[in-house]
Amino acid sequence: AMHVAQPAVVLASSRGIASFVCEYASPGKATEVRVTVLRQADSQVTEVCAATYMMGNELTFLDDSICTGTSSGNQVNLTIQGLRAMDTGLYICKVELMYPPPYYLGIGNGTQIYVIDPEPCPDSD
Amino acid sequence: AMHVAQPAVVLASSRGIASFVCEYASPGKATEVRVTVLRQADSQVTEVCAATYMMGNELTFLDDSICTGTSSGNQVNLTIQGLRAMDTGLYICKVELMYPPPYYLGIGNGTQIYVIDPEPCPDSD
């Protein structure tokens, strides 16, 4: 499989936002790339978000997605928002070179994202 | 060396409090035990806190210590408070069986404590 690198650990901010870079070693000159973020917890894998982009263009996630991102060459800067403590888990970056053929696939080792719920602020009375 | 077990990762609460258990395999029936918490960051090791206790009694840290703890058999429940994001690091549990002889020493593999600073609460005006 294609090599995909991502950080081992990231801490979400107290606002529940986590950002990390997913970098892939492209064998060739792909023009269409698909990036998917998967969450693995208790051996269950679920899709968090996905975006297909043309090289040189912006990543476009669905409007209701919790992810945003930008791309630069073979690097994708991913941001996941709205995270709560229960969302702590291993977030895996999957990269697919969709066009031109052939198809190449790479899976990162995952980024362990830790999320701590903030203490509620005291009532202002 | 004596075997010492501690968790690999702990998240500090949003209030900057982290707790973990340090468990040691005692070769004999020690009556006096010393527990030290060391912090390793950038290959520098510093002492965070230390307490000597008699088996069956409470751990007593110094009054100005950021640590508190309780013991139960060969387990020590450690709590570190007042942590900030800059305190993120590897916290190593060191256990010494001081009395009766012979002296035994054990060092854990360390607990990576992650600390996220909370967002300030909005002014109540």
């Epitope: 060739g28 000159k29 894998v45 198809y103 696939l105 | -």
Partner: antibody, heavy 115, light 107 residues
Framework: EVQLVESGGGLVQPGGSMRLSCAAS????????MNWVRQAPGKGLEWLAQ??????????YYSASVKGRFTISRDDSKNSVYLQMNSLKTEDTGVYYC??????WGQGTLVTVSS | DIQMTQSPSSLSASVGDRVTITCRTS??????LNWYQRKPGKSPKLLIY???NLASGVSSRFSGSGSGTDYTLTISSLQPEDVATYYC?????????FGSGTKLEIK
């Protein structure tokens, strides 16, 4: 038009050697990982070997059935990939295909190992 | 190595039938699965890549689905020209093995 043309097949005795060649055209050869796949008579497709490209330091991978006997290589200046087959066995008989990461395939070349 | 279990090994169906072939892997391959069609005397032809994507020039009668360890190739309305052997392949592994094949015939 993409083309992959295998050559070098034929009849060889057990224990013998043979070198297969695959000439590619119509696509950027150096951008691709190249593979050899075979089909033995009455059997299914069997992946044999893969050679990656320059960004992957020309890493090679082999199936357990051919490791130590077969060697895959490539020459990007000639748009060609090769399979050197040594210590051939009767069970190596089949049609050998070269493929550019399974998107493009050659027409195959028949290798018969028999005494 | 990842094991590929393809079923059935053969099947016979009528023209117009909906046909499904399944492939199960011994571990999660994250959608890294291709499907091929091989007709006698011809080279294998890529039908589906990445579990769900239709290869260029392939009829929309063919579709792929699945994730994790379970994958399916579906032919929505079987045609006489679909008589062939179909193979799944794991493309995630460094050793991209094939399934054992499914021989499809017309009743």
């Amino acid at each position: 038009e993409v083309q992959l043309v295998e050559s070098g097949g034929g009849l060889v005795q057990p224990g013998g050697s043979m070198r297969l060649s695959c000439a590619a055209s119509g696509f950027t050869f150096s951008d691709n990982w190249m593979n050899w796949v075979r089909q033995a008579p009455g059997k299914g497709l069997e992946w044999l070997a893969q050679i990656r490209n320059k960004p992957y330091n020309y890493e090679t991978y082999y199936s357990a059935s051919v490791k130590g006997r077969f060697t895959i290589s490539r020459d990007d200046s000639k748009n060609s990939v090769y399979l050197q087959m040594n210590s051939l066995k009767t069970e190596d008989t089949g049609v050998y295909y070269c493929t550019a990461q399974f998107a493009y395939w050659g027409q195959g070349t028949l290798v018969t190992v028999s005494s | 190595d990842i094991q590929m279990t393809q079923s059935p090994s053969s099947l016979s169906a009528s023209v117009g039938d909906r046909v499904t072939i399944t492939c199960r892997t011994s571990e999660n391959i994250y959608g890294g699965l291709n499907w091929y069609q091989r007709k006698p005397g011809k080279s294998p032809k890529l039908l589906i890549y990445g579990a769900t994507n239709l290869a260029s020039g392939v009829s929309s009668r063919f579709s792929g689905s699945g994730s994790g360890t379970d994958y399916t190739l579906t032919i929505s309305s079987l045609q006489p020209e679909d008589v062939a052997t179909y193979y799944c392949q794991n493309v995630l592994s460094s050793r991209p093995g094939f399934g054992s094949g499914t021989k499809l015939e017309i009743k």
